[in-house]
Amino acid sequence: AAPCPDACCPHGSSGLRCTRDGALDSLHHLPGAENLTELYIENQQHLQHLELRDLRGLGELRNLTIVKSGLRFVAPDAFHFTPRLSRLNLSFNALESLSWKTVQGLSLQELVLSGNPLHCSCALRWLQRWEEEGLGGVPEQKLQCHGQGPLAHMPNASCGVPTLKVQVPNASVDVGDDVLLRCQVEGRGLEQAGWILTELEQSATVMKSGGLPSLGLTLANVTSDLNRKNVTCWAENDVGRAEVSVQVNVSFPASVQLHTAVEMHHWCIPFSVDGQPAPSLRWLFNGSVLNETSFIFTEFLEPAANETVRHGCLRLNQPTHVNNGNYTLLAANPFGQASASIMAAFMDNPFEFNPEDPIPVSFSPVDTNSTSGDPVEKKDETPFGVSVAVG
């Protein structure tokens, strides 16, 4: 095949090689960019910047090599459009630094930076950490900082991400209140900060105020939905990013719902309770306090992380006629109490009077005359026959 005269020539089925001296000063308009998985660039002294727009349209790119060129700056968002990038070789360029943001979000198996005049500073603390943790093949490169010695020996005591403190009101917050949160940011080289409020939705009206180093956030006219929702303050510097999440507890009174008993492997009287603080629960059976045992007890379902409502069952293991009756769930917190009741019938009373039977003596500890709905077990299925008579 005739040698390729162009600045960039196809290589394999989805690769491109650009090795003609000084032919490129940017990566715009590369041929067949959409399907490229491999891009190899060498000897491009005029290629000094790599920016977001340069790699737009290279969504399939896996391997990028830019070596022995004039690269001096890689933008923090340069690889935003190449999320599949797994190998990045930028060796023997003019790079003095590389932001942690550049590789954030990528799953790089290999990152090669040898042969660059790196300048040891906190901005390369992330790279030093990669070297310490054996990531991306970095340790094998024994990276040097220009005139400063090995990257591994760079002092890093002062290289920390920002420190955040979020102040939340310690007084009780009620529905309808306005709440002021303040995020204090400390640290060197602060670049950006803000609030993440994606979970809030309709929980409050949001107003942001202030800027570094003190960010304010007013949550106006809060609702009970604000409970369990994260309000997150974030800040970035050249070392990395820090986030702190807080939750605002909005007080509201207890509420309770009871549902008809259902038979599963065991019997369940389903309930839902809500309230902030979480209400205490108490069951009554036919008006008297129900002592929970391994045969009848409260079982909670796994709570959803972002809501206060709790769902569960009053679980009954193999209940009999003595468990038929009226079940009441009482829920209470400092802001109010609520109750709900339901009738449950698990099986027939085997001591029902039948003119043909001897008169039974019932030692049942509760009154079981009233049941609701159809009995679950028919009389001829019950394990209790009547054989005790008086007289």
Partner: antibody, heavy 115, light 108 residues
Framework: EVQLQESGPGLVKPSGTLSLTCAVS?????????WTWVRQPPGKGLEWIGE???????NYNPSLKSRVTISVDKSKNQFSLKLSSVTAADTAVYYC????????WGQGTLVTVSS | SSELTQDPAVSVALGQTVRITCQGL??????ASWYQQKPGQAPVLVIY???KRPSGIPDRFSGSSSGNTASLTITGAQAEDEADYYC???????????FGGGTKLTVL
């Protein structure tokens, strides 16, 4: 499959406190089950001591209630029995089991009360 | 009274049917469960609830109840069924558990 294993001293002095632990494996102590202690004096029948739920609910045999404490340690997936003021009548094989049906048992551990 | 009463000993010819009984007031209100115990071993659950058998328990074991009496029936007793059998149920108060005194079954 759930397995239970009792452990603790095999000899306790009269008036002392008997302490046993039951380690639960093959399942979580925080599941929808209660956990119980049963004892059996040599050559005699079974006696229920008490039960506990991971949320802290407890029930005890009325005849032992004043001397018994059952507790649960969710972090170690185990529950424990303490029986105070023991006498020779408390000499028995002590079993832990899963309530309410006692479908899984430990192998039992003999505790002798003697000076 | 929180008591369950069992016959101390029962015998059965190999292959025959035997009924072991348990009497108590609480059995009018609650199901009995039954446990088999062989010498030097922990008890094994054989019947619970409304005549339910755990997996691995042969179907020759069955449970029933009438009035204040619960029964464990072994239909076609085998040599390996020789053991002590204990009944248990909730006490009438429902707040604690009680065991019967046990029945020693001999298979002849």
């Amino acid at each position: 499959e759930v397995q239970l294993q009792e452990s603790g001293p095999g000899l306790v002095k009269p008036s002392g406190t008997l302490s046993l632990t039951c380690a639960v494996s093959g399942g979580s102590i925080s599941s929808s089950n209660w956990w119980t202690w049963v004892r059996q004096p040599p050559g005699k029948g079974l006696e229920w001591i008490g039960e506990i739920y991971h949320r802290g609910n407890r029930n005890y045999n009325p005849s032992l209630k004043s001397r018994v404490t059952i507790s649960v340690d969710k972090s170690k997936n185990q529950f424990s029995l303490k029986l105070s003021s023991v006498t020779a009548a408390d000499t028995a094989v002590y079993y832990c089991a899963r309530a309410p049906w006692f479908d899984y048992w430990g192998q039992g551990t003999l505790v002798t009360v003697s000076s | 009274s929180s008591e369950l009463t069992q016959d101390p000993a029962v015998s059965v010819a190999l292959g025959q049917t035997v009924r072991i009984t348990c009497q108590g007031l609480s059995l009018r209100s609650y199901y009995a469960s039954w446990y088999q115990q062989k010498p030097g071993q922990a008890p094994v659950l054989v019947i619970y609830g409304k005549n339910k058998r755990p997996s691995g328990i042969p179907d020759r074991f069955s449970g029933s109840s009438s009035g204040n009496t619960a029964s464990l029936t072994i239909t076609g007793a085998q040599a390996e069924d020789e053991a002590d059998y204990y009944c248990a149920s909730q006490a009438s108060s429902g707040n604690h558990l009680i065991f019967g005194g046990g029945t020693k079954l001999t298979v002849l």
